[in-house]
């Protein structure tokens, strides 16, 4: 069918809960593309009718809620004007008995997200909630060993639970819960988190890793158009900003009048443990003054640069 397979994602999910997966793969999905979801090898696309339990919502596939029979491989097909890409998502659905008093046990959290708190530090846990904007998510509540968390050491900050002065007693089974409203119907989302405590000194916050560039030079002809991506991996829901700077100034500010060099719109791909961010810098026309100047990609405390240089003369032309 001429579509290029990009990658396979595996997701293990709890039955009777809403679930959503977004089909994004920058830079492919940042342009003019159409996205269509299919189940297994079916030629019939997933419904776009919002009343359907399983339906496509823009680039998302949305299950309201997940059921046993929904396990399987789903394909998302991204069609551009001259391209076709396909992402495979393998969903495995199973039953969970969280804190059901009639069953009387703690939830089996072994296969859920595992997070770490640093002993003696102020730290945080993250509730991973990824749904399209047609879903309104109610306030997040946090539970530890089936009891709602309260106390001066804890603060709910957006999707985070802040924990001050972490102690050994903070290890255990946590869950974050929110009510999801979609088309007037309400569903409960409950995510389990196994929390362990480490004494190893953790860095403050998250330190992003710049995959590209790597403090190097790029040969480019005078007058050409150049686009360079800055690729950054960082923790989910991080607070770091990513940008391009020159002479310690944002490129959009530095070239505010001419707009010859601009920063692009940031995009990201969400993985289970981290996000991959891409923000590009576009030189509409490379000029002499651009050569030898470090153009810096900043991501939180991390930096990396590119330096433009003229190509070596090609003497074969003479």
């Amino acid at each position: 069918d001429g579509c290029k397979d990009i990658f396979m994602k595996n997701e293990i999910l709890s039955a009777s809960q809403p679930f959503a997966f977004n089909c994004t793969f920058p830079p492919i999905t940042s342009g003019e593309v159409s996205v269509t979801w299919y189940k297994n090898s079916s030629k019939i696309p997933v419904s776009k009718i919002i009343q359907s339990r399983i339906h496509q919502d823009e680039t998302w596939i949305l299950f309201l809620p997940m059921e046993w029979g929904d396990s399987g491989v789903y394909q998302c097909v991204i069609k551009g004007r001259d391209s076709c890409h396909r992402i495979h998502v393998n969903l495995t659905v199973f039953e969970k008995h969280w804190c059901d008093t009639s069953i009387g046990g703690l939830p089996n959290l072994s296969d859920e997200y595992k997070q770490i708190l640093h002993l003696g530090k102020d730290d945080s846990l993250t509730c991973h909630l990824h749904f399209p904007k047609s879903c309104v998510l109610g306030p997040i509540k946090w539970y530890k060993d089936c009891n709602e968390i309260k106390g001066e050491r804890f603060t709910v900050l957006e999707t985070r639970l802040l924990v001050s002065n972490v102690s050994a007693e903070d290890r255990g089974n946590y869950a974050c819960q929110a009510i999801l409203t979609h088309s007037g119907k309400q569903y409960e989302v409950l995510n389990g988190i196994t929390v362990s405590i480490t004494e190893r000194a953790g860095y403050g916050g998250s330190v992003p890793k710049i995959i590209y560039p790597k403090n190097h030079s790029i040969e480019v002809q005078l007058g050409t158009t150049l686009i360079v991506d800055c690729n950054v991996t960082d923790t989910k829901d991080n607070t770091n900003l990513r940008c391009w700077r020159v002479n310690n100034t944002l490129v959009d500010d530095y070239y505010d009048e001419s707009k010859r060099i601009r920063e692009g719109v940031e995009t990201h791909v969400s993985f289970r443990e981290h996000n991959l961010y891409t923000v590009n810098i576009t030189f509409l026309e490379v000029k002499m003054e651009d050569y030898g100047l470090p153009f810096m990609c900043h991501a939180g405390v991390s930096t990396a640069y590119i330096i433009l240089q003229l190509p070596a003369p090609d003497f074969r032309a003479y």
């Epitope: 945080s124 904007k133 998510l137 957006e158 001050s164 916050g205 944002l250």
Partner: antibody, heavy 117, light 107 residues
Framework: DVQFQESGPGLVKPSQTLSLTCTVT?????????WNWIRQPPGKGLEWIGY???????NYNPSLKSRVTITRDTSKNQFSLKLSSVTAADTAVYFC??????????WGQGTLVTVSS | DIQMTQSPSSLSASVGDRVTITCRAS??????LNWYQQKPGKAPKLLIY???MLHSGVPSRFSPSGSGNDYTFTISSLQPEDIATYYC?????????FGGGTKVEIK
Amino acid sequence: DVQFQESGPGLVKPSQTLSLTCTVTGYSITADFAWNWIRQPPGKGLEWIGYISYSGDTNYNPSLKSRVTITRDTSKNQFSLKLSSVTAADTAVYFCAIRGPYSFTYWGQGTLVTVSS
Amino acid sequence: DIQMTQSPSSLSASVGDRVTITCRASQWINNYLNWYQQKPGKAPKLLIYYTSMLHSGVPSRFSPSGSGNDYTFTISSLQPEDIATYYCQQGHTLPWTFGGGTKVEIK
């Protein structure tokens, strides 16, 4: 809970420097997040001034950048705002706030600073 | 800077009425849109973050929607305690900017 307390002089003379401090309790300012200053002139809307991040990075609103400095004292879990060459237009309630991944989630109660001779 | 245009600037409604406030961004903000409530003499309080997520303790009568450049905020049944000024704010591009505010009063 994370809580904030702004402090500093309520009256500053024109052309002088406005100095305010925000004391944070309940969470270390070096642990994560961005720690912000926002202001609101009487009867008007809100204006973001700038932040200092957990790592010490700063970012300022370009409209105030030439006059603003935000610093921190990690031993006291405080961050501070200095705004130089003030005029009557800088009269406002100044708030400190934590920014999570998306929003200014929690705010101090604010302190009114009047610029007048 | 991204301009945030809020409308209306003020409105008067009866208890139990449905109230809608809109916010338009001058550029694409990728859903990084927050709503705050401010009562006289108090600090703003976060109500909604990232377009569609209700902050801790916020009642379900507050209902958000929107994407791209246009966002709305609805109070399904206005209560006396909802009398306040409401602000939208974009958190996508520095400098972070606020709308001009919408003052909600009871008829």
